[in-house]
Amino acid sequence: EPPTACREKQYLINSQCCSLCQPGQKLVSDCTEFTETECLPCGESEFLDTWNRETHCHQHKYCDPNLGLRVQQKGTSETDTICTCEEGWHCTSEACESCVLHRSCSPGFGVKQIATGVSDTICEPCPVGFFSNVSSAFEKCHPWTSCETKDLVVQQAGTNKTDVVCGPQDRLR
């Protein structure tokens, strides 16, 4: 595609190239043959993040505590507010418009990856030799107790939900 009639950071209006408003400012009036583009800074709690010809600035996002949200990064005239979730909660979408409680890993499953403000807990089934007997958002699968290192023997086999039960070795009479 060939370049357009107006350069970067310009726009075409009524047969002339006018300067776009810089980020953080909105358009008040287009340029004319005799005047420059007129721009005004965005107000408090407003922003525009690109070179633009918008006549209204966008409102900063509101991090609603009733939805479990809090401010991660305060907005400026050039950037929107970034929300994240309260401790123990995570965003339901990339836009982080609401939060849900972190999921817990059921018995038989351990935490593979602890949840963050933007991602849920990732669980994995406990493999042979490991168990989890609690519902938790933090606990990994624990290895079965090694009876041998305690000079004990396995009295009850472990499962993915229970540890092995160790007991004393039978004495030879």
């Epitope: 009639a5 209006i13 047969s15 002339q16 004319t32």
Partner: antibody
């Protein structure tokens, strides 16, 4: 004073191409856009495209895309409009105009007749 | 594209009378509306740009008004040299588009 002087009338056969020139004087050629418009006999005005003579950037009416080419030669303050694959309904007066706030100054027009 | 509709198609007026020409856009054009005069054998002339700005050298009897989608060209007292065809044109959104014209003729 601002003047736009266009090349003379042309008669072309269907399928041929035509190149109309527009020589500007009386202002800084690279400071204003050049617009191209046509008017078929007894009809209204139809916008073809616009060129920035400063660096050759263009915008075309979708209707003419692929058939029209706008160019400019800064050294002689002249803009050109070339229309290819001519059809009988391209018969019209072709105008160049200097931009500003609107089409501020117009050329006298160039009659292009397409006939077999 | 934005469709420009002019009315009336022909306006018959006596010299010295007032003439009012209308132009309607199919959507809001934010005052980017220009008026042109065309006479046989002469170059097209810009009369008014951006709704109401009189172009250099144009007599003050020509004036423009309007907003949104409705615009008006007024010639307060018609002179003999004002009998011509008048076109409106929007400069808000590509492709630029023109009205079909209003012919102002002697009554």
């Amino acid at each position: 004073q601002v003047q736009l002087v266009q090349s003379g009338a042309e008669v072309k056969k269907p399928g041929a191409s035509v190149k109309v020139s527009c020589k500007a004087s009386g202002y800084g050629f690279t400071n204003y856009l050049i617009e191209w418009v046509r008017q078929a006999p007894g009809q209204g005005l139809e916008w073809i495209g616009v060129i920035n003579p400063g660096y050759g950037g263009v915008n075309y009416n979708e209707k003419f895309k692929g058939r029209v080419t706008l160019t400019a030669d800064k050294s002689i303050s002249t803009a050109y409009m070339e229309l290819s694959r001519l059809r009988s309904d391209d018969t019209a007066v072709y105008f160049c105009a200097r931009g500003g706030s609107g089409f501020a100054f117009w050329g006298q027009g160039t009659l292009v007749t397409v006939s077999s | 594209e934005i469709v420009m509709t002019q009315s009336p198609a022909t306006l018959s007026v006596s010299p010295g009378e007032r003439a009012t020409l209308s132009c309607r856009a199919s959507q809001d054009i934010s005052n980017h509306l220009n008026w042109y005069q065309q006479k046989p054998g002469q170059a097209v002339r810009l009369l008014i740009s951006s709704t109401s700005r009189l172009h250099s050298g144009i007599p003050a009897r020509f004036s423009g008004s309007g907003s949104g989608t409705e615009y008006t060209l007024t010639i307060s007292s018609l002179q003999s040299e004002d009998f011509a065809v008048y076109f409106c044109q929007q400069g808000n959104t590509l492709p630029w588009t023109f009205g079909q014209g209003t012919k102002v003729e002697i009554k």
